[in-house]
């Protein structure tokens, strides 16, 4: 697994270096998570032909994965910093149950899956410190999440492989959109 931000040897060897700003730390954290997702996607694609699945087939799912929309204020047109930040944090909180689902889905990248999950928790904490309007952030219901997790784990193996692929793809897209938006803040 790649070394989490702030723990690489360069940081240790250069204590006189300027500490990272809040925005730089968030940027670095997201890029670290994206690297982890790439490694997980590699294993998924090597294991099965899921990565050749058509967009149409992937669209026919009943997963409610977070997705950026125009109204969220994260795109260049109609950009709204506060609305967008709330959307990013809410979306990441909603992704947490899916990241929990991924934990038993990898054979050779088990640590990588755990690293993505833990780094996302840290990212949420960073962003919550940045947000002014924490009351607008809705936290998913734990009971609903527990039953969703049970349902996902009960699926047949093919569906679980497809679900894994879709979660990774959607999470990557969400983080990339978040990264672009946060760089405008």
């Amino acid at each position: 697994a790649p070394v989490p931000p702030g723990e690489d040897s360069k940081d240790v060897a250069a204590p006189h270096r300027q500490p990272l700003t809040s925005s730089e730390r968030i940027d670095k954290q997201i890029r670290y998570i994206l690297d982890g997702i790439s490694a997980l996607r590699k294993e998924t694609c090597n294991k099965s032909n899921m990565c050749e699945s058509s967009k149409e087939a992937l669209a026919e799912n009943n997963l409610n994965l977070p997705k950026m929309a125009e109204k969220d204020g994260c795109f260049q047109s109609g950009f709204n910093e506060e609305t967008c930040l709330v959307k990013i944090i809410t979306g990441l909180l909603e992704f947490e149950v899916y990241l929990e689902y991924l934990q038993n889905r990898f054979e050779s990248s088990e640590e990588q899956a755990r690293a993505v999950q833990m780094s996302t928790k840290v990212l949420i904490q960073f962003l919550q410190k940045k947000a002014k309007n924490l009351d607008a952030i809705t936290t998913p219901d734990p009971t609903t999440n527990a039953s969703l997790l049970t349902k996902l784990q009960a699926q047949n193996q093919w569906l679980q492989d497809m679900t894994t692929h879709l979660i990774l793809r959607s999470f990557k897209e969400f983080l990339q959109s978040s990264l672009r938006a946060l760089r405008q803040m």
Epitope: L58, E107, K151, Q155, N156, Q157, W158, L159, M162
Partner: antibody
């Protein structure tokens, strides 16, 4: 050709245990989940549970927890089911069935193992 | 658990005619464009024989007169034209998730 060969019929006494086997051939044993299904004489079918031979992960129907134990042996490509504390209610035919994969691979069933519990 | 309701419980059809068996699921058995509904034929003393898998794909060696259709929660097995050898029990089964569940069965006879 995918084949599942199940062990022969069993006549056992109440309170005893029985262990049946399901030998797989024609595919990579560790790549597919193996399910077990019960059918009592003249009745419908009931799912017992499954084992993933890759990591020996199991999932059971609540009703069969404590009754059935699923194991597998990679070296012989064989799945096993042990039934304990047998009663007349356990008299049935038991099938192993390999799970398919999407629309590419269909499920495949064994011929069944008949278990009769009688004193 | 997904409950499968099969109808009718029994059916008598003349040779050469059409037999239609229905199966309704308590929730959708679809996922990523595939319907995980299977149909089995079972004769006395024999194991279930897979006729149709993922709603409409024919099992190996299954005659073309056996046709499956449907998606979501409603599925049908059609047998046409009915032949002597088709007299048996028929079951639907969902393999979308565990526990696998089965319909109550339809006893098909020659009229």
């Amino acid at each position: 050709e995918v084949q599942l060969q199940q062990s022969g019929p069993e006549l056992v006494k109440p309170g005893a245990s029985v262990k049946m086997s399901c030998k797989a051939s024609g595919y990579t044993f560790t790549s597919y989940v193996m399910h077990w299904v019960k059918q009592k004489p003249g009745q419908g079918l009931e799912w017992i549970g499954y084992i993933n031979p890759y990591n020996d992960g199991t999932k059971y129907n609540e009703k069969f927890k404590g009754k059935a134990t699923l194991t597998s042996d990679k070296s012989s490509s064989t799945a096993y089911m042990e039934l304990s504390s047998l009663t007349s209610e356990d008299s049935a035919v038991y099938y192993c069935a390999r799970e398919g994969y999407g629309n590419l691979e269909r499920d495949c069933w064994g011929q069944g193992t008949s278990v009769t519990v009688s004193s | 658990d997904i409950v499968l309701t099969q109808s009718p419980a029994s059916l008598a059809v003349s040779l050469g005619q059409r037999a239609t068996i229905s199966c309704r699921a308590s929730e959708s058995v679809d996922g990523f464009g595939i319907s995980f509904m299977n149909w089995f034929q079972q004769k006395p003393g024999q194991p279930p024989k897979l006729l149709i898998y993922v709603a409409s794909n024919q099992g190996s060696g299954v005659p073309a007169r056996f046709r499956g259709r449907g998606r979501g929660t409603r599925f049908r097995l059609n047998i046409h034209p009915m032949e002597e050898d088709d007299s048996a029990m028929y079951f639907c089964q969902q393999s979308k998730e565990v526990p696998w569940t089965f319909g109550g069965g339809t006893k098909l006879e020659i009229k």
